[in-house]
């Protein structure tokens, strides 16, 4: 009488998460009487996957009808495979008894599960930085298997080279995670720029996953200030304008100072946007020259995005002709008690 053999023909089987796996097993003899069981892993800690004798295993079915005695095929289907199902599966024949006695095990079939990486999530710095500074972006993707994966960084379509990538864990696992940090040097033109993290994996069939981040969230372009005056039609009035150029983001507070004293404060509104994504804004004062005859310094002070204020000063120029137009009744001290009229545009 030939000795019973348990044959598992495949050394390994690979399936994609969500699909079904078929694990094949045949026996060369039905003698002695006793159940066939499937286990994941070997040794005392092995996990029972299917017992053809009894039990409720909702994800496992036999390939052929187990009630046909002359059927020596004990192959099983496992449905809805997840990465947690990875491992080596053993088909084991027992002799009926109390307890059942293990007679022979198959050589085992290693089930590897191909699992897609999650959509890459790109996160930028917590604080904004100014042009010429370097900022870091992090890209994370999880739950993929096998471990081999390729990650690339792009800025506006151009591949970046300054990045560091780690795949965890280092050892064998049911699934893996990748984390990569790229260093990007900001320029003044980066308000409209975008960084892209691209992940390629065997499960994606050549169609990589991408995660993006906008540099607009990471950059602060400080404004440049210019203050100038222009005469008005009324001979005793001049327009003093503060031109705030090329700033990002929009948040801006402007204060006019008259010889160091706060004259008025306003928040930027009605901005004009430049092609590069930065903004311009201008604020102006209508100054009565008769109230300000000599030595008045007007200062435009700008606080941008919560940063320390920058300022630009302008000494008010009053011509001899304008002075002549002022009657004695309108002349007064250098710091006129009445605040000058202001405006913005």
């Amino acid at each position: 009488e030939e000795e019973l053999q348990v044959i598992q023909p495949e050394k390994s089987v690979s399936v994609t998460a969500g699909e079904s796996a078929t694990l094949n097993c045949t026996v060369t003899s039905l003698i002695p009487v006793g159940p066939i069981q499937w286990f994941r892993g070997a040794g005392p800690g092995r996990e029972l996957i299917y017992n053809l004798k009894e039990g409720h295993f909702p994800r496992v079915t036999t390939v052929l009808d187990p009630t046909k005695r002359n059927n020596m095929d004990f192959s099983i289907h496992i449905s809805n495979i997840t990465p947690a199902d990875a491992g080596t599966y053993y088909c084991v024949k027992f002799r009926k008894g109390s307890p059942d006695v293990e007679l022979k095990s198959g050589a085992g079939t290693e089930l590897s599960v191909r699992a897609k990486p999650s959509a890459p999530v790109v996160s930028g710095p917590t604080a904004r930085a100014t042009p010429e500074h370097t900022v870091s972006f992090t890209c994370e993707s999880h739950g993929f298997s096998p471990r081999d994966i390729t990650l690339k960084w792009f800025k506006n379509g151009n591949e970046l080279s300054d990045f560091q990538t780690n795949v965890d864990p280092a050892g064998k696992s049911v699934s893996y995670s990748i984390r990569s940090t790229a260093r990007v040097v900001l320029t003044r033109r980066d308000v409209h720029s975008q960084v892209i993290c691209e992940v390629a994996h065997v499960t994606l069939q050549g169609d990589p996953l991408r995660g993006t981040a906008n540099l607009s969230e990471a950059i602060r372009v400080p404004p440049t200030l210019e203050v100038f005056q222009r005469p008005m039609r009324a001979e005793n009035q001049v327009n003093v304008t503060c031109q705030v150029r090329k700033f990002y983001p929009q948040r801006l507070l402007l204060t006019w100072l008259e010889n160091g004293n706060v004259s008025q404060t306003e928040t930027a509104s009605t901005l004009t946007e430049n092609k590069d994504g930065t903004y311009n804004w201008r604020s102006w004062l209508l100054v009565n020259t008769c109230a300000h005859r000599d030595g008045v310094v007007l200062t435009c002070q700008v606080e941008h995005d919560g940063q320390p204020a920058v300022s630009k000063s302008h000494a008010l120029e009053v011509s001899a002709h304008q002075k002549e137009q002022c009657s004695d009744t309108t002349s007064g001290p250098v710091l006129a008690p009445t605040a000058p009229l202001g405006g913005s545009g």
Epitope: E1, L30, I31, V33, G34, P35, I36, L52, K53, E54, P66, T67, K68, R69, N70, K96, G97, S98, P99, D100
Partner: antibody, heavy 118, light 107 residues
Framework: EVQLVESGGGLVQPGGSLRLSCAAS????????MHWVRQAPGKGLEWVSA???????YYTGSVKGRFTISRENAKNSLYLQMNSLRASDTAVYYC????????????WGQGTMVTVSS | DIQMTQSPSSLSASVGDRVTITCRAS??????LAWFQQKPGKAPKSLIY???SLHSGVPSKFSGSGSGTDFTLTISSLQPEDFATYYC?????????FGQGTKLEIK
């Protein structure tokens, strides 16, 4: 349809012999462990004998040496040769198929009556 | 030989009742226990194998449990056709042995 049909029962004197037959249909008898179970009038069930797929045979103590179980694959039939019959062997004899993994009984014949009496 | 003891030997119940029959083995039989139903003048019918698995076509009102030496058969809601004699059987080792039977009668 899977079916077992017994025959060969009847009245026999003590010390006499009888051969019971069980014809199987709807399955291959040689692929299963097969059994004989009996039930004396008004009594419970008693397992009598079995034959395994390899031809190995088993008997309950009271019939050992007197009864012989066998099968004929060509006829898909099971037999029980009963010799030296006693009054205590009087019973309905059932042919039973053992189940797939563990030999649990699944299919029963309708039974044949054996009466041992003088 | 392994002795099988059923209790009670007889039981009176009404239609709709839930009844439980117990079976005890004289030694550990793992879960190699079967239950059979027999009506007068008929061959036994296989109900349950490996203590809790229902044979094909057996209604789910029948359920079995237990392992080792103590086992139960439960019929959840008795119907007229369920009044019969029930037997347990061990089949872990030869000679296979049956319990003495439990006669379930209508009250």
């Amino acid at each position: 349809e899977v079916q077992l049909v017994e025959s060969g029962g009847g009245l026999v004197q003590p010390g006499g012999s009888l051969r019971l037959s069980c014809a199987a249909s709807g399955f291959t008898l040689s692929s299963y462990d097969m059994h004989w179970v009996r039930q004396a009038p008004g009594k419970g069930l008693e397992w009598v004998s079995a034959i395994g797929t390899a031809g190995d045979t088993y008997y309950t103590g009271s019939v050992k040496g007197r009864f012989t179980i066998s099968r004929e694959n060509a006829k898909n039939s099971l037999y029980l040769q009963m010799n030296s019959l006693r009054a205590s062997d009087t019973a309905v004899y059932y042919c039973v198929r053992g189940g797939v993994w563990d030999d649990a009984f699944d299919i029963w014949g309708q039974g044949t009556m054996v009466t041992v009496s003088s | 030989d392994i002795q099988m003891t059923q209790s009670p030997s007889s039981l009176s119940a009404s239609v709709g009742d839930r009844v439980t029959i117990t079976c005890r083995a004289s030694q550990d039989i793992n879960n190699y226990l079967a239950w059979f139903q027999q009506k007068p003048g008929k061959a036994p019918k296989s109900l349950i194998y490996t203590a809790s698995s229902l044979h094909s076509g057996v209604p789910s009102k029948f359920s079995g449990s237990g392992s080792g030496t103590d086992f139960t058969l439960t019929i959840s809601s008795l119907q007229p056709e369920d009044f019969a004699t029930y037997y347990c059987q061990q089949y872990v080792s030869y000679p296979y042995t049956f319990g003495q039977g439990t006669k379930l009668e209508i009250k």
